[in-house]
């Protein structure tokens, strides 16, 4: 039950996170005009990954797309790439995790397969979240650098007669949306990985049972070889001579493939 809840919660948190990453990527307010020096500007500038906008005090808003690809800063291209990779990984992760959900039955899919898929989607969510956080952080760093550079040479002009003021930009709403969304996706991914441990089928152990076939006195002991699904501790199919009888403590003490999570 706890496993299902963890998996379900991980899925929902990741879903919200990825929706947030998509929203942040599409938002125009990655950077907004710093109004510290001029709070009564008649035009307010803000920029996104795909276009820059100006909102006049009348409410009229005009946006212009970045129609060039080669003329854009490499950092902006990198941020775009990171966000898109994050979205793609997240989307694939969501698709995989839907089929991995314990509450959804698809044919005769085994728990081991669901565990594998849960782990895969979890890792995808983690990488997706990291991509988003990295992208937003790179952009934020770029903003901070440009902010102080434009502050240093704020006024240039002819003999101080004409002021050509460089527009300074500060953090926009999209950055905070991106950070939170990336964090949620990351958390969701971790939860999926934790859920994966619980989904991994425990070793099914049987007590030794004697089957007497008619005419032959042969004792058959099942569990001589453990079924190797890749999730058990015995991956080399070593012969078990104790008939599979173990205490509960012993079973849990064996290291699992997923104990690092």
């Amino acid at each position: 039950m706890a496993v299902t809840a963890c998996q379900g919660l991980g899925f929902v948190v990741s879903l919200i996170g990825i929706a947030g990453i998509i929203a942040a990527t599409c938002m125009d307010q990655w950077s907004t005009q710093d109004l510290y020096n001029n709070p009564v500007t008649a035009v307010f500038n803000y920029q996104g990954l795909w276009r820059s906008c100006v909102r006049e005090s009348s409410g009229f808003t005009e946006c212009r797309g970045y129609f060039t690809l080669l003329g854009l800063p490499a950092m902006l291209q990198a941020v775009r790439a990171l966000m898109i990779v994050g979205i793609v990984l997240g989307a694939i992760g969501l698709l995989v995790s839907i089929f991995a959900l314990k509450c959804i039955r698809i044919g005769s899919m085994e728990d081991s397969a669901k565990a594998n898929m849960t782990l895969t989607s979890g890792i995808m969510f983690i990488v997706s979240g990291l991509c988003a956080i990295a992208g937003v952080s790179v952009f934020a760093n770029m903003l901070v650098t440009n902010f102080w550079m434009s502050t240093a040479n704020m006024y240039t002009g002819m003999g101080g007669m004409v002021q050509t003021v460089q527009t300074r930009y500060t953090f926009g709403a999209a950055l905070f949306v991106g950070w939170v969304a990336g964090g949620l996706t990351l958390i969701g991914g971790v939860m999926m990985c934790i859920a994966c441990r619980g989904l991994a089928p425990e070793e099914t152990n049987y007590k030794a049972v004697s089957y007497h076939a008619s005419g032959h006195s042969v004792a058959y002991k099942p569990g001589g070889f453990k079924a190797s699904t890749g999730f058990g501790s015995n991956t080399k199919n070593k012969k078990i001579y104790d008939g599979g009888a173990r205490t509960e403590d012993e079973v849990q003490s064996y290291p699992s493939k997923h104990d690092y999570v």
């Epitope: 008649a42 100006v54 004409v162 527009t167």
Partner: antibody, heavy 119, light 112 residues
Framework: QVQLKESGPDLVAPSQSLSLTCSVS????????IHWVRQPPGKGLEWLVV???????TYNSGLKSRLSISKDNSKSQVLLKMNSLRTDDTAIYYC?????????????WGQGTSVTVSS | DIVMTQAAPSVPVTPGESVSISCRSS???????????LYWFLQRPGQSPQLLIY???NLASGVPDRFSGSGSGTDFTLRISRVEAGDVGVYYC?????????FGAGTKLELK
Amino acid sequence: QVQLKESGPDLVAPSQSLSLTCSVSGFSLTSYGIHWVRQPPGKGLEWLVVIWSDGRTTYNSGLKSRLSISKDNSKSQVLLKMNSLRTDDTAIYYCVRHPAFGPHAMDYWGQGTSVTVSS
Amino acid sequence: DIVMTQAAPSVPVTPGESVSISCRSSKSLLNSNGNTYLYWFLQRPGQSPQLLIYRMSNLASGVPDRFSGSGSGTDFTLRISRVEAGDVGVYYCMQYLEYPVTFGAGTKLELK
């Protein structure tokens, strides 16, 4: 067609208050901002204040303490109040339309109302 | 506040000729989005001002294409080709980048 009509007293005594009304027709105040601009006799234009379609206001900082603007969308009227009048407030007062949905600024002006501040 | 300077108080012109009226701002009106927030108005004698040019170079509706605006971030020119008697009046430039909105002192167009 688009019309803006300013109305108010012709003569006001110094230190008194002035109330001006801008009545508009041919458009709605829910889609346009209204500026007040004045022109002292034989001089240039001076911007006073603006009230936007959503009710936001911006004042000329030099006159902010003496100005107050409000509007009634249903009556299609904008009211400008100015207190502590001085003789240098003598001017023609214009109300001006500003679209909220396009790049044009101050695209239609009223005919103006002349206000004289004198004892 | 941004100061708008119209150096020439009046400009005499012969009907049918072209004339240029200049305006200068104390600060660049070129915004980072590429728009220049400079406007031109004409106030004919005894009338209210009317919008001629918005955002430095765009013609307002109903304004003949004899009028054109140009300039850099701080220096602007209103050009009138084939001047007519109806063009007489005071031409004002205005900045709308920052509050308070400010106007130039005006340049009077007079016929020779």
